[in-house]
Interface confidence: low
């Protein structure tokens, strides 16, 4: 639904003539006619099939219009649709004599006709006013139209019926192209949904109304993220409702028993480590160089002849040092120094001596890596597959195994829209983000180059005199429409002046 | 007036060749496109060729792809369908057809031309 | 390949309506046209692109297509209008016919 509007500004009739070439008499009082109908390639009479209008009398001769909108005027003129726009039009304005007070067309005598023009073409809906003058050898009028929608009435074609609502069913203004824009705090389809408090949690919380938030049973706090421990818990929490987990050092249903001995008491000595095993037991880790139940006694790490192999051992001050004989290393002279001799490389690995055969390398076989090759190559920890890939590890080697839309070895293609030709008649297809595009060759249009396209008889611009060209498609000929005071088949005679004009 | 006119129709035995021709007038003949359909004797209508208004584009049927040849002389005013191979199953009416413009289908056809393949 | 579907045979009385339906995958997004053979004759152009008509063919000839079906309507059937009636479309490979439907006037 919506409005076509034209603007009547200017008509000029010098000479005050009808279109029959007679004078009016004082004047022309002059008053418009406007026929509003489907576009037709020649415009021709019959039903104003999107409506019509008539002014009152505007002036005499020569006159400009008045804007009326402000006042309630009715200029511009008003041609309401109830329809869905269909973007064309033909549009006819005839400029009336009205001898007396009697604008009705049975009131006025035929010859009362001062002058009409007919146009046709493309309009879009929008607030842009289109500006048009039109001459004829005797008369000019000036006038602007446009189309615009009518209230709640949006889109290209004011098809989209949309009302701002504020309620149960939704909370929403209309945006010009007629989608729904929500209310602040609102979302959803229809804008029905409340937008709860920022961070309130999804499954645990919820809202009736904007930057609310309410919480289900078993959890609290003000985004709804705190669950509540059993009705009665002490000294303990939860990570889900109604459960009891204890403190360190509290025990029992209700951890109201308390098990830290160690805070309570400090019974180990020396920097020890203090650990609860059960109600009123506990255990101590000692320091290196104590010993005893609470680490009570100081005792020489080196008793315990911690080196091997012959190392000799001494005592520091937060523990030992072993120094090792030649051939042996290691933090208790454990390891020996080995060679190729020793076969050293597992899993198949090659053995390289270096440095005159005083140490040694490994070459690990696919898929085993380490000093030794001890340790199997796990080929998914680089993450190989592109776009959301996922790694499988198949013996030796790994796959990629891809999202829909995706192929190649990582996964790093894209599955080609235009794989299948789908452009017809040679066209080029272009691979787009979010589908294709076919490029037609001459003689073809449509979206996939499907329609065939002919030779336009009207492209040479045959036709004289600023006259209309169309094409006769069954015949592929032109037809010249002249413009008032031009005849001929291609307009190129003009039309001699009636004998009975005064001067 | 629109018109079009085929002749070379015949009697041709299997394997044998016939040139079909198309004389068009009353109408732009190098602008449009161009087509040839077929009807075997109390059968429907089969589409056999088509050829765009300046000759580059020709499709075929798949029943006569590799046999059947379109082409046209625009100075000519003409159409013509280059018959090889021809099989007992290629008996039919042949009629020349102008295409519209823009998918309009067949608006202007000829009277049609006998083809018989018998041996 | 693409294949239109047509009813072989419609009988209806004189001053009465006619449907004759074409059927295939989609066919609403294809373009549809009609025409007309009456015996002995070449095909008439009735409609094309879906439901227009060219000049010289009368009013009550009128045609639609959506979904999967493309319908001919003959509205007051006169006995001239007996005759085979195609219903055609363009596909990849090239244009398809219709196999064709026998429109008896009773």
């Known amino acids: 639904s919506g409005v076509f509007q034209l603007q009547l500004q200017e008509f000029i009739n010098e000479r005050g003539v009808l279109a029959s070439g007679r004078p009016c008499e004082p004047g022309c009082r002059t008053f418009f006619r406007v026929c509003l109908k489907h576009f037709q390639a020649v415009v021709s009479p019959g039903p104003c099939t999107f409506g019509t209008v008539s002014t009152p009398v505007l002036g005499t001769n020569s006159f400009a219009v008045r804007d009326d909108s402000s006042g309630g005027g009715r200029n511009p003129l008003q041609l309401p649709f109830n329809f869905t726009w269909p973007g064309t039009f033909s549009l006819i304005i005839e400029a009336w004599h009205a001898p007396g007070d009697d604008l009705r067309p049975e009131a006025l005598p035929p010859d009362a006709l001062i002058s009409k023009i007919a146009i046709q073409g493309s309009l879009a809906v929008g607030q842009n006013w289109l500006l048009d003058e039109q001459t004829s050898t005797l008369t000019r009028l000036r006038y602007s139209y446009r189309v615009i929608c009518s209230d709640n009435y949006y889109g290209d074609n004011c098809s989209r019926l949309c009302k701002k609502r504020n309620d149960h069913f939704g909370h929403y203004v209309c945006q010009p192209d007629g989608n729904l824009s929500c209310l602040p705090g609102w979302t959803g389809e229809y804008c029905q949904q409340p937008i709860c408090l920022s961070g309130c949690h999804e499954q645990n919380g919820y809202c009736s109304k904007p930057a609310e938030c309410l919480c289900r049973p078993g959890w609290q706090g003000r985004l709804c993220n705190e669950c509540i421990p059993h009705n009665g818990c002490r000294h303990g929490t939860c990570s889900t409702p109604w459960q009891c987990t204890c403190d360190e050092g509290w025990g029992g249903l209700f951890c109201d028993q308390d098990l830290n001995y160690c805070t309570h008491h400090s019974p180990c000595k020396n920097g020890a480590t203090c650990s609860n095993s059960g109600q009123r037991s506990y255990t101590c880790t000692c320091r290196p160089g104590y010993t005893g139940v609470d680490c009570e006694l100081e005792l020489s790490e080196c008793d315990s002849n911690p080196c091997r192999n012959g190392g000799s051992c001494k005592d520091q001050e937060d523990g030992y040092h072993c120094l090792c004989p030649p051939g042996y290393y290691g933090l208790h002279c454990e390891h020996s120094t080995l060679s190729c001799a020793d076969s050293p490389c597992f899993n198949g690995g090659s053995c390289r001596e270096r440095n005159q055969g005083a140490n040694y390398a490994c070459e690990c076989p696919p898929n085993f890596t380490g000093s030794n090759c001890e340790k199997k190559v796990d080929r998914c920890t680089s993450n190989p597959c592109a776009n959301g890939g996922q790694c499988l590890n198949r013996g030796p080697s790994r796959m990629c195994r891809c999202r829909p839309g995706f192929t190649g070895t990582y996964c790093e293609l894209h599955v080609s829209d235009c794989a299948r030709n789908p452009c017809a008649h040679g066209g080029t297809c272009h691979d787009l983000e979010n589908g294709l595009m076919c490029t037609c060759p001459a003689g073809f249009s449509g979206r996939r180059c499907e329609v065939r396209t002919s030779i336009d008889a009207c492209a040479s611009s045959p036709c004289f005199n600023r006259a209309t060209c169309y094409t006769d498609l069954s015949t592929d000929t032109f037809v010249c429409n002249c413009p008032y005071g031009f005849v001929g088949s291609r307009c190129e005679f003009p039309v001699g002046l009636p004998p009975s004009f005064p001067w | 007036e629109v018109q079009l006119v085929e002749s070379g129709g015949g009697v041709v035995q299997p394997g044998g060749s016939l040139r079909l021709s198309c004389a068009a007038s009353g109408f732009t003949f190098g602008n449009h496109w161009m087509s040839w359909v077929r009807q075997a004797p109390g059968k429907g209508l089969e589409w056999v060729a088509d050829i765009s208004s300046d000759g580059r584009y020709k499709y075929y049927a798949d029943s006569v792809k590799g046999r059947f040849t379109i082409s046209r002389d625009n100075s000519k005013n003409t159409l013509y369908l280059q018959l090889n191979s021809l099989r007992a199953e290629d008996t039919a009416v042949y009629y020349c057809?102008?295409?519209?413009?823009?998918?309009?289908?067949?608006?202007?056809w000829g009277q049609g031309t006998m083809v018989t393949v018998s041996s | 390949s693409y294949e239109l579907t047509q009813p072989p045979s419609v009988s209806v009385s004189p001053g009465q309506t006619a449907s004759i339906t074409c059927s295939a995958d989609n066919l609403g997004n294809q373009y549809v046209s009609w025409y007309q053979q009456k015996p002995g004759q070449s095909p008439v152009l009735v409609i094309y692109?879906?439901?227009m008509r060219p000049s010289g063919i009368p009013e009550r000839f009128s045609g639609s297509n959506s979904g999967n079906t493309a319908t001919l309507t003959i509205s007051g059937t006169q006995a001239m209008d007996e005759a085979d009636y195609y219903c055609q479309a363009w596909d990849w490979s090239g244009e398809v016919f219709g196999g064709g439907t026998k429109l008896t006037v009773l």
């Open positions: 057809a102008k295409a519209g413009g823009g998918n309009v289908g067949f608006d202007i």
């Open positions: 692109q879906d439901g």
